[in-house]
């Protein structure tokens, strides 16, 4: 037989089909010019010593073969003995190691078989009524196709599906969408209405995420508040990566899961913007405020479930940083200014009450005064911190108040509101004899002592009613008792106690009279 002709004889090897899974597959045959034809196939398995034979049977009952050697592509003309106008069946037999391996048959009319391309270029993927919709432009001059898809998950083999006939400039396919696993899709096409025409190659992989993005399993930690009033939020555990099918590993556009961080600053509710969304990779610095942090996972089909954490406020207080002066016109706070043109947010809430009851005020951008201080004033009529109780005050600062992640904590401290000097006056002052020349003075704790850092000291004043001499004794804010010694028997004394803050002298308690009785010896 001539090499250019199909040989109408028994093949030069015994028929010993191995039935193995490897071997020739994906045989495609088509016309490539007016009188020339091509068949190509793939071979799976070791290629050493393999000889391929393209087999052809005609409807007349005769069969022939082309010897292709080690090649997996073969061209022939319409003069090679193969009927091109009538239906023929073709397959490949690969002879190796004393056995034959067969490809599946293709049955077609060669003359009408055009080489079809798989979907080329961009395949658009969208979700439609719980299914996956793929859409692509029909390859040039190939309108009218039958389309198939195959799909697999990381744990399942390929499954074949049908897209149905296509007859337009754009083609589309509805495919199953998995809820929780990524899928790899490939598409192939063949000429519509041409009995037995060959399938195109499979398209490049189309990688599709699950309908539900994986729930982020992450943990955060927050560092200590730094000197600049900011603390870093750090990710303790990265989100688990989505398992991908084989063809989507490495570069898999389409299956990306985007994790975003949504910050909600709970403190200082009077600021302009309370939430900000960031990429998870860019961990922000936060002020000492309380925050809710949500991690939102999303893919090309939209957001999934999110996970939310609460980051409590940093309650570290600096009792001396804030000066408060109470005048007839109202109250003014002073604190060390941060920088030029800063906006401050002053937040206060009664101690022991729910954080939801916080009140705040936003200052206009201000520069430091000549002493380097920033200020905030309010009148008595405003009612701010007007009740005689302990308030927790936090001051935040930002040069860009519209940017949530640029706030910093200036200070946190406690303040006793209303008329603190009067409200803080100690009550229930009592005097007990202690010795021949001393007494013990006790009092109930000042209301100011409920406010950490506010009560600087108690002062006990003792007045000799005879000589009008006065002595004052400072007492630690944690103490409610003092011993007065060096007293004289028979002399009348009055004792008073006051509670002082760092910026305010207290009001004396009601004078308490006492005297040490003269001891008469027997």
């Amino acid at each position: 037989c001539r090499t250019s002709e199909c040989c109408f004889q028994d093949p030069p090897y015994p028929d010993a089909d191995s039935g193995s899974a490897s071997g020739p597959r994906d045989l495609r045959c088509y016309r490539i010019s007016s009188d020339r034809y091509e068949c190509s196939w793939q071979y799976e398995g070791p290629t050493a010593g393999v000889s391929h034979f393209l087999r052809c049977c005609l409807s007349s009952g005769r069969c022939c073969y082309f010897a292709a050697g080690s090649a997996t592509r073969l061209q022939f003309s319409d003069q090679a003995g193969v009927s091109v106008l009538y239906t023929v069946t073709l397959w490949v037999e690969s002879w190796a190691r004393n056995q034959t391996e067969k490809s599946p048959e293709v049955t077609l009319q060669l003359y009408n078989s055009v080489k079809y391309e798989p979907p080329l270029g961009d395949i658009k993927v969208s979700k439609l009524a719980g299914q996956l919709r793929m859409e692509w432009e029909t390859p040039d001059n190939q309108v009218g196709a039958e389309v198939q898809f195959r799909h697999r998950t990381p744990s399942s083999p390929w499954k074949l599906g049908d897209c149905g006939p296509q007859d337009d400039d754009t083609e589309s396919c509805l495919c199953p969408l998995e809820m929780n696993v990524a899928q790899e899709f490939q598409l192939r096409r063949r000429q519509l209405g041409s009995q037995g025409s060959s399938w195109s190659k499979w398209s490049s992989p189309v990688c599709v995420p699950p309908e539900n993005p994986p729930q982020p399993q992450v943990r955060f930690s927050v560092e200590q508040l730094g000197q600049d009033g900011r603390r870093r939020l750090t990710l303790k555990e990265q989100p688990t990566q989505l398992e991908l099918p084989e063809g989507c590993q490495g570069l898999a556009p389409g299956t990306e899961v985007t994790y975003r961080l949504q910050l909600h600053m709970l403190s200082c509710p009077c600021k302009a913007k309370a939430t900000r969304t960031l990429h998870l990779g860019k961990m922000p610095y936060l002020s000492g405020a309380a925050y809710n942090v949500a991690v939102i996972s999303s893919n090309q089909f939209g957001p999934g479930l999110n996970q939310t954490w609460h980051i409590p406020a940093d309650t570290h207080t600096e009792p001396v940083a804030l000066n408060i002066s109470v005048g007839t016109n109202g109250t003014t706070m002073y604190w060390p200014a941060r920088a030029q043109s800063m906006t401050y947010c002053i937040e206060w809430q009664p101690v022991g009450q729910d954080g939801g009851l916080a009140t705040c005020s936003l200052t206009a951008p201000q520069d430091p005064d000549p002493a380097g201080m920033a200020t905030y004033s309010w009148s008595r009529e405003s009612g701010a911190m007007g009740q005689e109780k302990c308030y927790y005050i936090t001051i935040f600062a930002s040069a860009h108040p519209e940017k949530l992640t640029l706030w910093s904590t200036v200070l946190s401290t406690y303040h006793f509101g209303g008329n603190a000097s009067a409200a803080g006056t100690p009550h229930h002052v009592s005097v007990k004899n202690h010795s021949l020349d001393s007494v013990s003075v006790d009092w109930a704790p000042s209301l100011l002592s409920t406010c950490p850092g506010v009560l600087k000291e108690y002062v006990v004043r003792c007045r000799d009613e005879d000589s009008k001499q006065v002595s004052e004794h400072p007492v630690q804010p944690t103490e409610t008792q003092v011993t007065l010694s060096g007293l004289r028997a028979g002399v009348a004394y009055t004792v008073q106690v006051r509670a002082d803050t760092a910026w305010l002298r207290g009001v004396w308690s009601q004078p308490q009279r006492f005297s040490i009785e003269v001891q008469v010896s027997d």
Partner: nanobody, 126 residues
Framework: EVQLVESGGGLVQAGGSLRLSCAAS????????MAWFRQAPGKEREFVAG????????HYVDSVKGRFTISRDNGKNTVYLQMNSLKSEDTAVYYC???????????????????WGQGTQVTVEP
Amino acid sequence: EVQLVESGGGLVQAGGSLRLSCAASGLTFRNYAMAWFRQAPGKEREFVAGITWGGGLTHYVDSVKGRFTISRDNGKNTVYLQMNSLKSEDTAVYYCAGKTQGSTWYHLTPDGYDYWGQGTQVTVEP
């Protein structure tokens, strides 16, 4: 040992249908083109229908075209003959036969076939 076992024959009224099956064992079924022959009393065995190893091509004798359909299931090592609109002249013993698919995939004469079954009787009453 190669065995081809036919089944599905029987008595049927004219115009009725039957489906014959031929189960193969002891051979690599997908290497063989298969055919159905029939032999009426006092006549020679005649070719009815043939099919290539993968089922891509089929061939029928003119007298059964449009009425009979040959098919195969390589997973089940079985070839079938669906016979519709049966006529009394279809009465015969039906045999299935197999041949390696070398330079031909069917022969109209029995001598081109390597293996044969024992046959199944089909009787069509007028």
